[in-house]
C-alpha cells in the first residue's frame, strides 16, 4: 500500500506594506509547530499593486477597494481555502501616510477608514491598518534581517546560507530607503545611545539587544528629489533648472504646485514668477552630489556625533543590510556586488549619469522614462547619503551588503512586523514578546 | 438632530429577498458611515454590514457576504439593506444606525426605529 | 473576529442599588468600546463610547472604565427606567461585534 502524504500543518500570514510609492502584499508561511523556532518563517508570495501609494488616494477613496482586490483574489487564491478565517492581515502604512497625517489628520483617518473598510469584506482574520511609526519600520526591518540571517538562533551553524553570512552572532545592521524615508538601524559597540528617542531595547530568544535606530522623514529618494528641486529652483534665473542629477538631453515640466504640494518642501517654499518650470538635465555626477549635500545640514550637532539635521548616529558598527530601494536602484545600476568598492562604484555612477539621455532610453528600452529617469539622481542620493549622511567610509563600504532577499523572503520590515504581532519572536525560549501587541491599537 | 426613518415591517417567503430603507433627516447623511443591525426574537444584536454613502464603499460581516447588498442614494439621503435567500432564521429586526467616528471608532449613535422581516412559509 | 463576552447574564437589583456590568475582549481594543441601552419593544441607545465617554443627554449616574480587554459599567443608583438590556460594542476592528448583553432586571 502507498503511503499518503499527511496534510502539512502549516500557518499563514499576510502583510501589506502601504509605502508611499505603491504598496506590496507580502504572504508568509510557517510550520504551526515550530512557531516559536527561529528561521522557519518564510515568505511563499509578492504581490505588487497596481497603482500608487494609498495616500494618493485622498481624493478618490472609493477607488481603494477596486486599488486592493487584484493582490487580495490573489492571497485567496494562495493560501488554501480552509486557513483563510485563521490567516490573520495587517496593513502597515509608512512614511507616505505620515506625511500625510502631517497635512491632515481628518484626510489620513478618511483613507485608512476605508482601507480597513475594504480589507475587512475578505475571509481572512483582518487585524486592522495603522500608520507605523519610523522607529518601528526601523526595528521591524532589523528584526526581519537578522532573523532571516538566523543570527537570533542560539546555534551557532557551520554552514553558511547566504553569500555574505559570517558565522558568529553579531547582527547585521539595517539600512532602509524607501520614497518618503529612511531607516538606519543597529546595534552600536558599546556605546551609549545619548539621544532616548533613538534607543531600543529589545530581549529576543534570551538575549538582549541595546539597538539604535531613526528614521529620516522627507529623505526618501522620492522625497528627497523634492527638495532638491525646490531648493535648486530658488536659485534658477528663470523657469529653466539646468539639473546634473539628470542625463544630458532629458527634459521634463514641472508643475511647481506640485512641487510644494508635499510638506518636504515648505522650507524652501517662495513665490515664484512662474507656474511651471522644465527640468534640463546636464549629468554631472560630482555637481548633483554637491546639490544633494545641500539637504544634508551637518553645521549644528548637539551630541558627541551626528549623521545631519542634528541626529545622534554612534559610530558604525559591523556589517550592514542595505534594502528596498538601496537594492533596487543598486541592482539597476549592476552595483550590488560585494567586489566592488566604493570608488568603483563612484566612477560607475560619474559614467552613467554623463550618458545622454536618448542612449540610456535605447539601452533601457524596457524600463518606464519615469523611472529610469531619475537612476542618476538616486544613485548619487544613496552614495551621499551613505557617505557623508551616515559616514561610511571607502574602508567600512565593503561591510554594506545590498540585499534584496534573504532565503527567498524580501528584506524589509514586514516580515519583523508579522513575527511581532503573531507573538513569535519570544523574549525568552521561547517566552514573551519584544514589542507589545498593544502598540497595534 | 439627525433622524432615521426605516421603511415597514414585511413578511416574506424562504428563498426571496427583502429590500429595507433608511431614510436620514434633520442632518450629513454622506460623509457618516450607516450600519445595519439585526435581532432575531429574544436574541443580542449582531452586526451586518456598513456604507460610507460619500464613497459607496460597503463592507459586510462574513456571515452576510454574497447574501446581503448594502446601497445609499446622496440624492434621497436614503440606505438600503437587500437580503436575499431569506430562511426562516432571518425573522428579525432589522436597524440602521450612524456611526458617528470615523477610522477606528465605529459607535452607532444613532438608530432607526427598527423594521421588523417575518420569512414565513 | 473579537468576541465580547458580557457578564452576568442577568443582575437582580432593587432600584437605588449599584449596579457594576462586565464586558471582556478575546483581544486588545484599546479604548474603542460603547456600552448600549435597550428597552423592550425601542432601538438600542448609545451610553458609553470610548470606554468612559458619556454620549450627549445620558445622566452622571452612568459611567464606563476599564481599556485593553476589560470593561466595567457601572450605574451608581438604579432609576426604576435603568431596567433593560444592555450591550457592549467593540468599536475598533471589523467586524463590528456586541456583547451577548447583560438584562437588569427588578428584584
Known amino acids: 500500500t502507498q503511503n499518503k502524504a499527511l496534510p502539512e500543518n502549516v500557518k499563514y500570514g499576510i502583510v501589506l506594506d502601504a509605502g508611499s510609492s505603491h504598496t506590496s502584499l507580502y504572504i508568509y508561511k510557517w510550520p504551526a509547530e515550530k512557531e516559536n523556532d527561529t528561521g522557519v518563517v518564510h515568505q511563499v508570495e509578492e504581490c505588487r499593486v497596481k497603482g500608487p501609494g494609498i495616500s494618493k488616494f485622498v481624493q478618490k477613496v472609493n477607488e481603494i477597494g477596486i486599488y486592493l482586490t487584484d493582490c487580495m483574489e490573489r492571497a485567496r487564491e494562495v493560501i488554501p481555502r480552509s486557513q483563510h478565517q485563521e490567516t490573520p492581515v495587517y496593513l502597515g502604512a509608512t512614511a507616505g501616510m505620515r506625511l500625510l497625517r502631517m497635512e491632515s489628520e481628518e484626510l489620513a483617518d478618511r483613507v485608512l477608514d476605508v482601507v480597513e473598510r475594504s480589507l475587512s469584506n475578505y475571509p481572512f482574520d483582518f487585524q486592522g491598518a495603522r500608520i507605523i511609526t519610523g522607529q518601528e519600520e526601523g526595528a521591524y526591518g532589523w528584526i526581519t534581517i537578522n532573523y532571516l540571517l538566523g543570527k537570533f538562533s542560539q546555534k551557532t551553524r557551520w554552514f553558511s546560507i547566504v553569500p555574505y553570512e559570517t558565522n558568529n552572532q553579531e547582527t547585521f545592521g539595517a539600512l532602509d530607503l524607501g520614497g518618503a524615508s529612511t531607516q538606519v538601524t543597529f546595534v552600536p559597540q558599546n556605546q551609549t545611545i545619548e539621544s532616548p528617542d533613538n534607543a531600543l531595547q529589545f530581549r529576543l530568544y534570551g538575549k538582549d539587544y541595546n539597538v539604535y535606530t531613526h528614521s529620516f522623514l522627507c529623505y526618501g529618494k522620492d522625497q528627497a528629489l523634492w527638495q532638491k528641486l525646490a531648493k535648486d529652483i530658488q536659485v534658477a534665473s528663470n523657469e529653466i533648472l539646468r539639473d546634473p542629477c539628470f542625463h544630458p538631453g532629458y527634459k521634463k515640466v514641472v508643475n511647481v504646485s506640485d512641487l510644494y504640494k508635499t510638506p518636504c518642501t515648505k522650507r524652501f517654499e517662495m513665490t515664484l514668477p512662474f507656474q511651471q518650470f522644465e527640468i534640463q538635465g546636464i549629468g554631472n555626477y560630482q555637481q548633483c552630489h554637491q546639490s544633494i549635500l545641500e539637504l544634508f545640514n551637518t553645521s549644528y550637532c548637539p551630541y558627541s556625533q551626528c549623521a545631519f539635521n542634528g541626529i545622534f548616529l554612534p559610530p558604525l558598527q559591523g556589517d550592514f543590510g542595505a534594502f528596498s530601494a538601496f537594492y533596487f536602484v543598486m541592482k539597476f545600476l549592476n552595483l550590488t556586488s560585494e567586489k566592488v568598492s566604493q570608488e568603483k562604484v563612484t566612477e560607475m555612477m560619474k559614467k552613467f549619469c554623463a550618458q545622454p539621455w536618448e542612449e540610456i532610453k535605447t539601452s533601457y528600452a524596457g524600463v518606464k522614462e519615469k523611472y529610469l529617469s531619475e537612476y542618476c539622481f538616486s544613485g548619487t542620493y544613496i552614495l551621499s547619503l551613505l557617505l557623508q549622511g551616515y559616514h561610511f567610509t571607502a574602508d567600512s563600504w565593503e561591510h554594506i551588503h545590498f540585499i534584496g532577499k534573504i532565503q527567498g523572503s524580501d528584506a524589509g520590515w514586514t516580515l519583523g512586523y508579522m513575527l511581532n504581532l503573531t507573538n513569535m519572536i519570544p523574549a525568552e525560549q521561547p517566552l514573551s514578546t519584544p514589542l507589545s501587541h498593544s502598540t497595534y491599537v | 438632530q439627525v433622524q432615521l426613518v426605516q421603511s415597514g415591517a414585511e413578511v416574506k417567503k424562504p428563498g426571496s429577498s427583502v429590500k429595507v430603507s433608511c431614510k436620514a433627516s434633520?442632518?450629513?447623511?454622506?460623509?457618516?458611515?450607516i450600519s445595519w443591525v439585526r435581532q432575531a426574537p429574544g436574541q443580542g444584536l449582531e452586526w451586518m454590514g456598513s456604507?460610507?454613502?460619500?464613497?459607496?464603499?460597503?463592507n459586510y460581516a462574513q456571515k452576510f457576504q454574497g447574501r446581503v447588498t448594502i446601497t445609499a442614494d446622496e440624492s434621497t439621503s436614503t440606505a438600503y439593506m437587500e437580503l436575499s435567500s431569506l430562511r426562516s432564521e432571518d425573522t428579525a429586526v432589522y436597524y440602521c444606525?450612524?456611526?458617528?467616528?470615523?477610522?477606528?471608532?465605529?459607535?452607532?449613535?444613532?438608530w432607526g426605529q427598527g423594521t421588523m422581516v417575518t420569512v414565513s412559509s | 473576529e473579537i468576541v465580547l463576552t458580557q457578564s452576568p447574564a442577568t443582575l437582580s437589583l432593587s432600584p437605588g442599588e449599584r449596579a457594576t456590568l462586565s464586558c471582556r475582549a478575546s483581544q486588545s481594543v484599546s479604548s474603542y468600546l460603547a456600552w448600549y441601552q435597550q428597552k423592550p419593544g425601542q432601538a438600542p441607545r448609545l451610553l458609553i463610547y470610548?470606554?468612559?465617554n458619556r454620549a450627549t443627554g445620558i445622566p452622571a449616574r452612568f459611567s464606563g472604565s476599564g481599556s485593553g480587554t476589560d470593561f466595567t459599567l457601572t450605574i451608581s443608583s438604579l432609576e426604576p427606567e435603568d431596567f433593560a438590556v444592555y450591550y457592549c460594542q467593540q468599536s475598533v476592528f471589523w467586524p463590528i461585534t456586541f456583547g451577548g448583553g447583560t438584562k437588569v432586571e427588578i428584584k
Open positions: 456604507i460610507i454613502p460619500i464613497f459607496g464603499t460597503a
Open positions: 434633520g442632518g450629513t447623511f454622506s460623509s457618516y458611515a
Open positions: 470610548d470606554a468612559s
Open positions: 444606525a450612524r456611526e458617528s467616528g470615523g477610522y477606528r471608532d465605529h459607535k452607532l449613535d444613532v
